[in-house]
């Protein structure tokens, strides 16, 4: 039984140009992590692998830093990064767990972070 | 050792459905080392890579933006192949097309990597 | 696209001398993170497909004669056969894997002078 729940920085918005630290986090679960992909629509962004670490896909070497610890950084951010971004944590023995960011990247200069909410 | 083997039609008439298969031995497709391409040679456009599947705990695809509105590239697990789709094709599409495997060392990168194994390439002509 | 860029477009050497294929992308296929250069050679003969020579711009392929040897950082490479053999004539190929689209030289042919 998957008793997990996963936490995200939910709806995001950040400055074209700017940065921005996606995060997830999976609690209220003994399940061992054994990696975390992050996607955006269905393409994948990097994997963070509990035996092999980091690597990102090769379309994003430049813009994509990994972490803080399984999140993601994203830069030089452009307003087609828009849009829904996907944690999926592969657990043992619970299996996959699933968090949804929408991020909205904003050519003004204000940029203000949404409240935090929670998947199940 | 792995080896790569190339099936499908040689000729396929303008506007239809250009597919490929390519029968993996020696490795699965499902391997978390590997990425399993689809690339094509002309005189016109030299080597051209066209798209990837490979597995992660998951399925993805990479596609070339020039045919991307136009190809599927899908893993089959059953029999141990992938195969390529290239819809609405066009005199432009005859090339020889190659399936090749994308081998990664994982602790370098898990994501890339160079085209080791190649498989005995087609020639296909559009052409009514 | 990172575009590769292959100079010259053919090469006639003697045997026994030495062959320098040079190959120029429009930018840095070096991965920070790893110190990696995302670069590899490949050879093709007629009626053949590529054979992979070198991956990582210096490392050797299992099975590749040591006269094939690979250099270069960044932006500049070069694929080096220190001694042509008749069985090296072929056209060469460089290929990018630091970002998709993956990317190929426009080929280098080698020819006996």
């Known amino acids: 039984m998957m008793t997990g729940t996963i936490e995200t920085t939910g709806n995001i918005s950040a400055e074209k140009g700017g940065s921005i630290i996606l995060q997830c986090h999976l609690s209220s679960t003994t399940a061992q992590v054994t990696q975390v992909n992050w996607e955006q629509q269905d393409q994948l962004l990097a994997i963070c692998n509990a035996d092999l670490g980091w690597h990102i896909s090769p379309s994003f070497k430049d813009r994509v830093a990994p972490g803080p610890g399984l999140g993601l950084t994203l830069q030089s951010l452009t307003v087609n990064d828009t849009g829904e971004y996907f944690c999926i944590y592969h657990t043992y023995p619970d299996g996959t767990y699933t968090g949804r960011i929408f991020l909205e990247v904003l050519e003004s200069s204000v940029a203000e972070h949404g409240a935090r909410f929670q998947i199940p | 050792q792995v080896q790569l083997q190339q099936s499908g039609p040689g000729l396929v008439k303008p506007s239809q459905t250009l597919s490929l298969t390519c029968a993996i031995s020696?490795?699965?497709?499902?391997?978390?080392?590997?990425?399993w391409n689809w690339i094509r040679q002309s005189p016109s456009r030299g080597l051209e890579w066209l798209g990837r599947t490979y597995y992660r705990s998951k399925w993805y695809n990479d596609y070339a933006v020039s045919v991307k509105s136009r190809i599927t590239i899908n893993p089959d697990t059953s029999k141990n192949q992938f195969s390529l789709q290239l819809n609405s094709v066009t005199p432009e599409d005859t090339a020889v097309y190659y399936c090749a495997r994308e081998g990664v060392l994982r602790y370098f990168d898990w994501l890339s990597g160079a085209f080791d194994i190649w498989g005995q390439g087609t020639m296909v002509t559009v052409s009514s | 696209d990172i575009v590769m860029t292959q100079s010259p477009d053919s090469l006639a050497v003697s045997l026994g001398e030495r062959a320098t294929i040079n190959c120029k992308s429009s930018q840095s296929v070096l991965y920070s993170s790893n110190n990696k250069n995302y670069l590899a050679w490949y050879q093709q003969k007629p009626g053949q497909p590529p054979k992979l020579l070198i991956y990582w711009a210096s490392t050797r392929e299992s099975g590749v004669p040591d006269r094939f040897s690979g250099s270069g950082s960044g932006t500049d490479f070069t694929l080096t056969i220190s001694s042509l053999q008749a069985e090296d004539v072929a056209v060469y190929y460089c290929q990018q894997y630091y970002s998709t689209p993956w990317t190929f030289g426009q080929g280098t042919k080698v020819e006996i002078k």
């Open positions: 020696g490795d699965s497709v499902s391997s978390n080392s590997a990425a």
